[in-house]
Amino acid sequence: MHVAQPAVVLASSRGIASFVCEYASPGKATEVRVTVLRQADSQVTEVCAATYMMGNELTFLDDSICTGTSSGNQVNLTIQGLRAMDTGLYICKVELMYPPPYYLGIGNGTQIYVIDPEPCPDSD
Amino acid sequence: MHVAQPAVVLASSRGIASFVCEYASPGKATEVRVTVLRQADSQVTEVCAATYMMGNELTFLDDSICTGTSSGNQVNLTIQGLRAMDTGLYICKVELMYPPPYYLGIGNGTQIYVIDPEPCPDSD
């Protein structure tokens, strides 16, 4: 299953990056799982994951750095709390969980660049 | 003449971006001209230019946003005062002006990403 996502995204100076993950659904899925993975220095780590019912909100864990909304075959993902050291390739993995058959799609990744802001001068 | 430059550079939160432009000199040039051009939306504009004698400092115009130093066949370029709207592909053009023969080399460009910082809160 094909998954499309932008090649490059810049995090805001507040450390927030948003991108769309779009999948070409071969069938009428009702339950979808979206996972964001980060690849850096050949290491892959899971950033966050959410399962949602089509037409409903994405629900990430309370302590997750991700939030998102869905619209049809598009998932709008937002990652927050990013620092310069979090710069890397963020890969969107989509699984159509129900009804069968199961489908898996993995995007080519979105390179997220993060720049740490200069500290504000102390107010005396 | 081959010119190498990095594919991607992030400007600092102060709007400063630095990159190295390296050329494979076919001869022993004593006078070199370096031009930085910005390509965005198929428009090409000249950002700054400097001619220097090998072993000497690069001298840009007083009102230039560029500064630089040279070391052998490498030119270390710094562009300052960048804003988010200045994001684009910055291409390094090198000309070996003297002695003959003249050589021209154009790099593939460095994609400079610039993020405007959040304003600091007013100090009451």
Partner: nanobody, 128 residues
């Protein structure tokens, strides 16, 4: 931003002469190609003459060799095209153009798609 403005076109008898001039902002551009192109009605735009500013080398289309001369006037910030022994087949809209990132120092060898900036053109009409 580069701005180009052509002038000097007009009607002329076959065998006559015209001098086209192109005013160029922020001139000169080192290591660039500056050229004259033309487009006759119903035909594709073609290169006429060009100059590589790094060396001052000039290049001409075979059809104009020996008749046209391209030159730059750095004092006036212009690129000029002296056209002598004009023929009816020289009738066309003439454009000047600048390529700040030339693929080659031989400025007519790689077509006109990479020329970054173009003027509005000046009409040359040669009657027999």
């Amino acid at each position: 931003q580069v701005q180009l403005q052509e002038s000097g076109g007009g009607p002329v008898q076959a065998g006559g002469s015209l001098r086209l001039s192109c005013a160029v902002s922020k001139y000169p551009y080192s290591g660039s190609c500056m050229g004259w192109f033309r487009q006759a009605p119903g035909k594709e735009r073609e290169g006429v003459a060009a100059m590589f500013t790094g060396t001052g080398s000039t290049y001409y289309a075979d059809s104009v060799k020996g008749r046209f001369t391209i030159s730059q006037n750095v004092a006036k910030n212009t690129l000029d095209l002296q056209m002598n022994s004009l023929k009816p087949e020289d009738t066309a809209m003439y454009y000047c153009a600048v390529d700040l990132l030339p693929r080659s120092t031989r400025c007519l060898d790689y077509g006109l798609r990479t020329y970054n900036y173009w003027g509005q053109g000046t009409q040359v009409t040669v009657s027999s």
